[in-house]
Structure formats: structure tokens, C-alpha cells
């Protein structure tokens, strides 16, 4: 697109509610969009006690707070649900909690996949 | 133009049945989501019912469930909403959107609305 | 279900008016929340989505903050065209569900 930002294409796609809202439970969304509007990934979680539930992953339209991020980074002290987005393909597979107020940074990884 | 154009609205009896349409131009319409949402006269907006692109998945307020049915044609790039079992409180104007591929999932095309009105 | 709470209601203002709406939702929606401006016997027309980017077209008078469960919809400077009735939407789940409507009225 000739502007030097990543170009996301694919991201990771995750739905907890996927029985309810009967979608598939996880696997990869090709980001379609507007030509004129930029395309993100995106992850959201939940850390309750230290144990980490995943929300919804996927791709994400147009957003000035995603622009130029190589890596998922949630930056909010303490949300009800973590939130972060990024670009560059299947960019939110990992995903990371750096509160801007500083404190540890945390760093959560997808399971490694069974080989077949 | 991206446009979303309903039709179908109008006078129906309580008990009565209705079949609102939706006709997609300028989009890709096989690949996005969309819903009905309704308006009665001097209230807000309700959803009603969703649709995924491929009409794999439908989802409905409880309000409808059980009366209304949400469907598409792909082939004439049409929306539909079958409304049975109406009832006066289902009076409103019934606006078909689009709701945008990747998230947040806005409504960001409306059609101009059709209006049903349930009464004796 | 997600409940949308706006306040006020409706509000009174003057052109030039810097006006301020709230929504609050009863659980987090995280950055799934959009907003809308609905004028009489018109269609919604979406102003902002994903809490804070302005949809195309939409002027720069209009900005959109919070998170979680908290949300603002600002319009810096009321302009005549803006007197409409605004709608906050959460896409977190399903059903969609909205806010009851704030109506800007002139003063």
C-alpha cells in the first residue's frame, strides 16, 4: 500500500463464546476491508488470579492505536478484559501485558501444537 | 454506491405474517455479516436478528425467537427477514445494516427502513 | 445480555457548545463499543467505532474515549447539522445491544 506500515492479511482467530454465537472456535481470518483503511490483529483476554482465558482474537479494522505495532501489547493496568492489537500477519498469536505505569511485563504463548 | 435498500413493510393484522427484503449494492455481499434492527415509533434501536456471510449461523433477540427467521440469497445479493406470529409491540420501523468484517463489527451501512405496523 | 446505559437522556445546548455523552456498559466490552447519530426519519449513521476511530467522512469535532465499561462521545463544538440523537452500540457479544439514546436539542 506504499505507506511502510506491516500489511496484515491473516490473523489468529480465537471466539470463547463460539458455541453460543456459533462460529468456529479458533483457527486463522483472512482481514478483508475498505481500500483507504489500514487492517489490524487483534487479542483479548482475561487474567484472573494469574490464570489467563483467552476472549476473542482476529483481525481488526482501522485503528490510530495499532499503527506501526509489530507486537500485541496490552497497556491498561488492570481491565476487566485485556485488549491489544498489531500489525503484520498472525502478529497476535503472542501476546503481552506492559502496563504503561510500568510493573513486570507478561508474555503469554499458544500452546505448542501437537505435530501430525 | 454502497447501498442497502428494504422492502416488504406495511399494515398486517396481530397473528399476522410479513416478509421483509434487503437488497445489497456495491459490496461484496457473500462475505459480511448482517443484521435487522428495529425502531419503534419514538423509542430506540433494538436489534433483531444477525446472519453470518455464508447463512451458516442466524441469531435472534429474544424478543423474535421462535417467530422471526433471518435469511439471504447470495445469488441476488438479498437479505430477508420472515416475520410471523406478529404482534402490536413488533410495530416499528425495520432497518437492515451491514455490519463491517473485521472487528469491532459496526454497523456502518444502513438502508433508509421499511415500516410495519401491526394492528386491527 | 449486555446492558447499555446513556446519560442524560436528552440535553439542551447552543451551537459553539462543547457537549458530552456518557454510556456505561454492565460488564466490559473492551474496545467493542461504537456510536451513532440518528437524525428524524433517518437511518443511524455510524459517527465512531472501536471506542475512539472516527468512520470516514465523519468531521474531527466528534471523538470518542474510554474503556472497559466506560465510554464518552464528545462534540467539541455543536454545530447546527449536529442536533440529532446519538446511540452507543457494544459488539462484544451477542445480542447487540444499544444505549437508550441521548437527543441533542437546541437551547
Known amino acids: 500500500s506504499g505507506r511502510g506500515e506491516a500489511e496484515t492479511r491473516e490473523c489468529i482467530y480465537y471466539n470463547a463464546n463460539w458455541e453460543l454465537e456459533r462460529t468456529n472456535q479458533s483457527g486463522l481470518e483472512r482481514c478483508e476491508g475498505e481500500q483507504d483503511k489500514r487492517l489490524h490483529c487483534y487479542a483479548s483476554w482475561r487474567n484472573s488470579s494469574g490464570t489467563i482465558e483467552l476472549v476473542k482474537k482476529g483481525c481488526w479494522l482501522d485503528d490510530f492505536n495499532c499503527y506501526d505495532r509489530q507486537e500485541c501489547v496490552a497497556t491498561e493496568e488492570n481491565p476487566q478484559v485485556y485488549f491489544c492489537c498489531c500489525e503484520g500477519n498472525f502478529c497476535n498469536e503472542r501476546f503481552t501485558h506492559l502496563p504503561e505505569a510500568g510493573g513486570p511485563e507478561v508474555t503469554y504463548e499458544p500452546p505448542p501444537t501437537a505435530p501430525t | 454506491e454502497v447501498q442497502l435498500l428494504e422492502s416488504g413493510g406495511g399494515l398486517v393484522q396481530p397473528g399476522g405474517s410479513l416478509r421483509l427484503s434487503c437488497a445489497a449494492s456495491g459490496f461484496t455481499f457473500s462475505s459480511q455479516g448482517m443484521s435487522w434492527v428495529r425502531q419503534a415509533p419514538g423509542k430506540g434501536l433494538e436489534w433483531v436478528s444477525a446472519i453470518s456471510g455464508s447463512g451458516g449461523s442466524r441469531y435472534y433477540a429474544d424478543s423474535v425467537k421462535g417467530r422471526f427467521t433471518i435469511s439471504r440469497d447470495n445469488s441476488k445479493n438479498t437479505l430477508y427477514l420472515q416475520m410471523n406470529s406478529l404482534r402490536a409491540e413488533d410495530t416499528a420501523v425495520y432497518y437492515c445494516a451491514r455490519e463491517q468484517g473485521p472487528g469491532p463489527y459496526a454497523f456502518d451501512i444502513w438502508g433508509q427502513g421499511t415500516l410495519v405496523t401491526v394492528s386491527s | 445480555d449486555i446492558q447499555m446505559t446513556q446519560s442524560p437522556s436528552s440535553l439542551s445546548a447552543s451551537v459553539g457548545d462543547r457537549v458530552t455523552i456518557t454510556c456505561r456498559a454492565s460488564?466490559?466490552?473492551?474496545?467493542?463499543l461504537n456510536w451513532y447519530q440518528q437524525k428524524p426519519g433517518k437511518a443511524p449513521k455510524l459517527l465512531i467505532y472501536?471506542?475512539?476511530t472516527l468512520q470516514s467522512g465523519v468531521p474531527s469535532r466528534f471523538s470518542g474515549s474510554g474503556s472497559g465499561t466506560d465510554f464518552t462521545l464528545t462534540i467539541s463544538s455543536l454545530q447546527p447539522e449536529d442536533f440529532a440523537t446519538y446511540y452507543c452500540?457494544?459488539?462484544?457479544?451477542?445480542?447487540?445491544?444499544f444505549g437508550g439514546g441521548t437527543k441533542v436539542e437546541i437551547k
Open positions: 472501536g471506542i475512539s
Open positions: 460488564q466490559s466490552v473492551s474496545r467493542f
Open positions: 452500540q457494544q459488539s462484544f457479544s451477542l445480542p447487540r445491544t
